[in-house]
Amino acid sequence: SQPQAVPPYASENQTCRDQEKEYYEPQHRICCSRCPPGTYVSAKCSRIRDTVCATCAENSYNEHWNYLTICQLCRPCDPVMGLEEIAPCTSKRKTQCRCQPGMFCAAWALECTHCELLSDCPPGTEAELKDEVGKGNNHCVPCKAGHFQNTSSPSARCQPHTRCENQGLVEAAPGTAQSDTTCKNPLEPLPPEMSGTMLM
């Protein structure tokens, strides 16, 4: 097998053997090493010498194999934009942000830039569960049979109707999507004006 060329090496077809860790330098018509994550180009390559990489300074980073001459500045998660930090910035990774609880990402440009309050789901509905929290606004779906939700809320979940018999009571009024079952003591009639769920 042919010996592997070590950067810098000449490239006539403007492509390099290892696209992730090497790049084509058009001025010199050679392939040079990229700098690993967490570093940047301190000195560019030439036909005599390879790229020299230096570690990113504190509060800066480069996430990928690169031939950047600077590191990117770490940016905090902006609470005014509804963002909160889930992981700090390192030399190899930018600050990881997410939407604050009760918010969703309203503006996305490679990453979330702006969060807004989740819409309330009205009584009788709940927010459809999403794969990723904060990814989109609430999509309210009706409570399934045997469940209810009695508030306007972005996060309240539909709860199962109370089963009166489990508490030694009897059903006074059936539950709906917006209200729980009303239970009563089997020996006492329920006054018509009472709207409580249980009478002991």
């Epitope: 010199h28 018509r29 301190s42 000195a43 560019k44 030439s46 036909r47 005599i48 020299v52």
Partner: antibody, heavy 121, light 108 residues
Framework: QVQLQESGPGLVKPSQTLSLTCTVS??????????WSWIRQHPGKGLEWIGY???????YYNPSLKSRVAFSVDTSKNQFSLKLSSVTAADTAVYYC?????????????WGQGTMVTVSS | EIMLTQSPGTLSLSPGERATLSCRAS???????LAWYQQTPGQAPRLLIY???SRATGIPDRFSGSGSGTDFTLTISRLEPEDFSVYYC?????????FGQGTRLDIK
Amino acid sequence: QVQLQESGPGLVKPSQTLSLTCTVSGGSISSGGYFWSWIRQHPGKGLEWIGYTHYIGSTYYNPSLKSRVAFSVDTSKNQFSLKLSSVTAADTAVYYCARVDTAMVDAFDIWGQGTMVTVSS
Amino acid sequence: EIMLTQSPGTLSLSPGERATLSCRASQNIDSSYLAWYQQTPGQAPRLLIYDTSSRATGIPDRFSGSGSGTDFTLTISRLEPEDFSVYYCQQYGGSPITFGQGTRLDIK
């Protein structure tokens, strides 16, 4: 402006190690875009590139001298050094330190004034 | 290793004349990576030209460089008294870096 100054013994015995230091003033040896070089000139002759180094540690030597040469950098003193082992009379020369500004690729834009080293018993 | 041959070995001219110094490489110097230096007796070389034709900082415009491939030229349009020195070419298109043997420019 940046200036370079070589220092070291002017006389070295055969088979011993030649040691020279170059002090950088008016700028930092830790500036990223520079390589720091050694070049020599035999009496009445042309110039010979010995090699160069970057403060981070990347070092390149002339293959004809590679087995005998070692460079080092002391950023705290703003100096870089040359060690040439097993010297013979053929190593008698004026030794220059010089800077490569990588914006000029591999041309030597600043030179020290040179120091004459004689190899003799 | 790329060998550089400079000619003539010595050039005798008068102040005010035009000087043309030649540097020929043993193989093609890709991307025109050639520099020229001036060295006066007892002094370190001084960079005049890099990348074949770019003048270094502070170099008068009477100095110019040209060429490509294997043939390169340093031209001094009107010789001044301080120009009478030794001139070296240097290539950095291949490892190791090499220099020519020099051209001595003498006053006629």
